[in-house]
Amino acid sequence: IWELKKDVYVVELDWYPDAPGEMVVLTCDTPEEDGITWTLDQSSEVLGSGKTLTIQVKEFGDAGQYTCHKGGEVLSHSLLLLHKKEDGIWSTDILKDQKEPKNKTFLRCEAKNYSGRFTCWWLTTISTDLTFSVKSSRGSSDPQGVTCGAATLSAERVRGDNKEYEYSVECQEDSACPAAEESLPIEVMVDAVHKLKYENYTSSFFIRDIIKPDPPKNLQLKPLKNSRQVEVSWEYPDTWSTPHSYFSLTFCVQVQGKSKREKKDRVFTDKTSATVICRKNASISVRAQDRYYSSSWSEWASVPCS
Amino acid sequence: RNLPVATPDPGMFPCLHHSQNLLRAVSNMLQKARQTLEFYPCTSEEIDHEDITKDKTSTVEACLPLELTKNESCLNSRETSFITNGSCLASRKTSFMMALCLSSIYEDLKMYQVEFKTMNAKLLMDPKRQIFLDQNMLAVIDELMQALNFNSETVPQKSSLEEPDFYKTKIKLCILLHAFRIRAVTIDRVMSYLNAS
């Protein structure tokens, strides 16, 4: 058993049929010695008396808010949560496996630049009685500070018969130099509590590996005289690290119709303009990627050909 | 000494061309190592990230773009210099800061060159003959060093009398390649910045 926060404790349980469970001793936070009784949740049934209560925690029915009273007055609370371990593996029931970039990916993180600011998100099908708490650091043995905000519900989607909820959090490394060469990864830890179930999820990464620039901005087309060719130009996204001559991007320019199966014109360039062949009912799209360290491509910025 | 004309565009900053070749060569070598040593811990997640130049050179700080010198976090505790202007071209005057940056890059290359050559000598003794260093990568390191045109003491190649542990050598190769790739990215960024200056 360990303390998650004040008056909230996590009991780690090996979860299998007829498991013996864990013996837990609760102590009432009071100078009083006599006349103390214990109850669980909203029940008025007295579970025991005395300053300490010893319980055998085996299942979710044994978890919850234990309260010690004296003469009708509440003295203190202890909330017990369960953390299940099945076949030596901690449960991951609360969050959905996003399977990208690999299986067992519950947390996904992205950074728009090298400033040390990043966003992580996760998915769940649970809609109520759900809380998240996020901590982060650079390295684990001698951790350096990363400050994370509160996790918020950022999107709701319908997936077949189920509703899916996306939560996200923004974090900022306290003292980040965009030009630094990372040798210690960022660690992100998410505590998830659903009703009386506790789970924790972690992710470890270098900012350089989670870079995904914003799409190029200000796409413009200029038809070339006596030709089907069009000169398309664009600018670096505002959120990208500066100076741009140091933090350079490379671009992919594509002309394609509505369907992905349609024929296309595609060209890669380090410049902020390119010449392509425009077709009726097609769109010109441009996306960006760090020129020197191949992490993710940005989303496409698009303009119609016509 | 005249710089080798290794770039098709005569106006182009020659070190930029060499640094692009360097990044490409080390990336290819790292990819090859990850594929060949698939049963060794050779991915970014599996290895310890060590920097053999730590406390010996200060490339990131010495080559910091002017715009980032206002960023407290980039100035650390070391004496930091930053790029003002200039290039690798022998005909142009380079500032003191600039020379500091380029000499730091040169020292990095020299240290990695020695490490890679020592390692290759060990790998050539491996009866499995599983992996060797790409000669192209070693040649590209040499070309960039020549283009930087610094003279410095020759670092003797480390020789070891003990029987090499090939497993450890291969893991060290992975560690070294990962670190060198990150440094090659920094070098490329610096050269690109200088080219635009």
């Epitope: 490379t250 595609r266 890669f268 062949i277 077709r279 | 565009d9």
Partner: antibody, heavy 118, light 107 residues
Framework: QVQLVQSGAEVKKPGSSVKVSCKAS????????LHWVRQAPGQGLEWMGW????????EYAPKFQGRVTITADESTSTAYMELSSLRSEDTAVYYC???????????WGQGTLVTVSS | DIVMTQSPLSLPVTPGEPASISCRAS??????LHWYQQKPGQAPRQLIY???QSISGVPSRFSGSGSGTDFTLTISSLQPEDFATYYC?????????FGQGTKVEIK
């Protein structure tokens, strides 16, 4: 199986024209760009131009501009390349090639040898 | 027009040995570079697209690398069927242009 089948070899006199055909099978004809590339005996490859069979748009290499015409007939899934004012240096194997991507070629025809000789 | 220069023009190789062919562009073409193989009396066959992207059906011993002006096609271990002429082609701008070809011959 995508295939491009070209017309047979031709012998032409200098100053005349030649029209080579390229019939496509497998896949929808208009879903691909179609190019013509030639290869003189013992020489390298030389791109001549492309057509978008969907709308008839064409683009030619400046070297052949005014002398080459590429057309396509969607009803028969056939593309044509006509080269006029032939000279001896036009003696070459002419290939048609296609792709969903405009600027490179994933499927090639077997080639048509055009000999220009007086 | 962008001029593509291949080297060497002829490459004698022992079967089972690796081979590398270089292709250089007269100006930067990013990764807009493709490789083809041609055997005598046959049409070219696509090997690699956009400098390093492999094609299904092409043996994994063929790999491409490079960007900007310098590109390389590598055959990790030459098989008897690999003796042919190899061409690079740029798609950065029209007109599309090819290298002059590299003939890989049996040593």
């Amino acid at each position: 199986q995508v295939q491009l089948v070209q017309s047979g070899a031709e012998v032409k006199k200098p100053g005349s024209s030649v029209k080579v055909s390229c019939k496509a099978s497998g896949g929808t004809f208009s879903d691909y760009y179609l190019h013509w590339v030639r290869q003189a005996p013992g020489q390298g490859l030389e791109w001549m131009g492309w057509i978008d069979p969907e709308n008839g748009d064409t683009e030619y290499a400046p070297k052949f501009q005014g002398r080459v015409t590429i057309t396509a007939d969607e009803s028969t899934s056939t593309a044509y390349m006509e080269l006029s004012s032939l000279r001896s240096e036009d003696t070459a194997v002419y290939y048609c090639a296609r792709n969903k991507e405009l600027r490179y070629f994933d499927v090639w025809g077997q080639g048509t040898l055009v000999t220009v000789s007086s | 027009d962008i001029v593509m220069t291949q080297s060497p023009l002829s490459l004698p190789v022992t079967p089972g040995e690796p081979a590398s062919i270089s292709c250089r562009a007269s100006q930067s073409i990013s990764i807009n570079l493709h490789w083809y193989q041609q055997k005598p009396g046959q049409a070219p066959r696509q090997l690699i697209y956009f400098a390093s992207q492999s094609i299904s059906g092409v043996p994994s011993r063929f790999s491409g690398s490079g960007s900007g002006t310098d590109f390389t096609l590598t055959i990790s271990s030459l098989q008897p069927e690999d003796f042919a002429t190899y061409y690079c082609q740029q798609s950065n701008s029209f007109p599309l242009t090819f290298g002059q070809g590299t003939k890989v011959e049996i040593k």
